[in-house]
């Protein structure tokens, strides 16, 4: 049975503006034309869906308008960006890839990217 391996970086540090980007790469066992990518956050054994997008190979990734994620795709590689992160959002972000069409369906799950978010220090009041 052909496996679908998903690779993602082990650790990413969010920017001071609360933006984190990482690449999710999958080794496709078939010639998929429709792919679904889901970002899951695992913290304290709780798993929540951060965002999800389905895209046609060769087309752009489209997340819902109110999503905190954006992304681009290139071949079997998806560049994901998560915005609006705060220190409390630090956790393991797992990339889940599903080959939706044509059959057969394949599921691949990455080991997760630990995203560290440090809230910026508030600017001290300036004395003029």
């Amino acid at each position: 049975c052909k496996a679908m391996h998903v690779a993602q970086p082990a650790v990413v540090l969010a920017s001071s503006r609360g933006i984190a980007s990482f690449v999710c790469e999958y080794a496709s066992p078939g010639k998929a034309t429709e792919v679904r990518v889901t970002v899951l956050r695992q913290a304290d054994s709780q798993v929540t869906e951060v965002c999800a997008a389905t895209y046609m190979m060769g087309n752009e990734l489209t997340f819902l308008d109110d999503s905190i994620c954006t992304g681009t795709s290139s071949g079997n590689q998806v560049n994901l960006t998560i915005q609006g992160l705060r220190a409390m959002d630090t956790g393991l972000y797992i990339c889940k890839v599903e080959l939706m069409y044509p059959p057969p369906y394949y599921l691949g799950i990455g080991n997760g990217t630990q995203i560290y978010v440090i809230d910026p220090e508030p600017c001290p009041d300036s004395d003029f």
């Epitope: 052909k2 899951l40 394949y106 599921l107």
Partner: antibody, heavy 118, light 108 residues
Framework: QVQLVESGGGVVQPGRSLRLSCAAS????????MHWVRQAPGKGLEWVAV????????HYADAVRGRFTISRDNSKNTLYLQMNSLRAEDTAVYHC???????????WGQGTLVTVSS | EIVLTQSPGTLSLSPGERATLSCRAS???????LAWYQQKPGQAPRLLIY???SRATGIPDRFSGSGSGTDFTLTISRLEPEDFAVYYC?????????FGPGTKVDIK
Amino acid sequence: QVQLVESGGGVVQPGRSLRLSCAASGFTFSSYGMHWVRQAPGKGLEWVAVIWYDGNNKHYADAVRGRFTISRDNSKNTLYLQMNSLRAEDTAVYHCVRGGIWGYFDYWGQGTLVTVSS
Amino acid sequence: EIVLTQSPGTLSLSPGERATLSCRASQSVSSNYLAWYQQKPGQAPRLLIYGASSRATGIPDRFSGSGSGTDFTLTISRLEPEDFAVYYCLRYGTSPFTFGPGTKVDIK
């Protein structure tokens, strides 16, 4: 809590049709793949079909492909199985099952019995 | 298409004994996408193990799963009266999803 309640089973003659429904509650229905799994009397479990998320993608077992159609209405949190050209070997309890985040089947309905007999 | 074979078909044991159930796949199961379910008469199946070795929420630690590739095992360390049931393995993660034929654990 997650609940899956099937309905629509009954006795039907070979060659006829039947439509099963599954009312889901306690979770965000559109975020999960939904399956039908059946079990003939005294036999093992057999996967029948799956429908993914928005309903655009569906996959079927060879035994039912071309005769059964899986569908969903995310606005009503309901899963369906339209069964046409029914055969005696389709007699089974049909379970509505949620495909969990990690891919395995995590919640099952109690099932509805379909009996195909003349 | 992967075929799962479970053995033995029936296992006759006494409460307190150890039960070892086997699930063998005709091809390697990718990413250990293998789950175990328990089913009692008139009830829906109940998830015990996923990912070959991870216990589902609320499952007692006397249930454990092991294995990889083509050979998987469900072990019940000490059988309790409520453990006598039929056990199925499931290969997931790729369609078609496949169940094993089941192993019945009954009271000796």
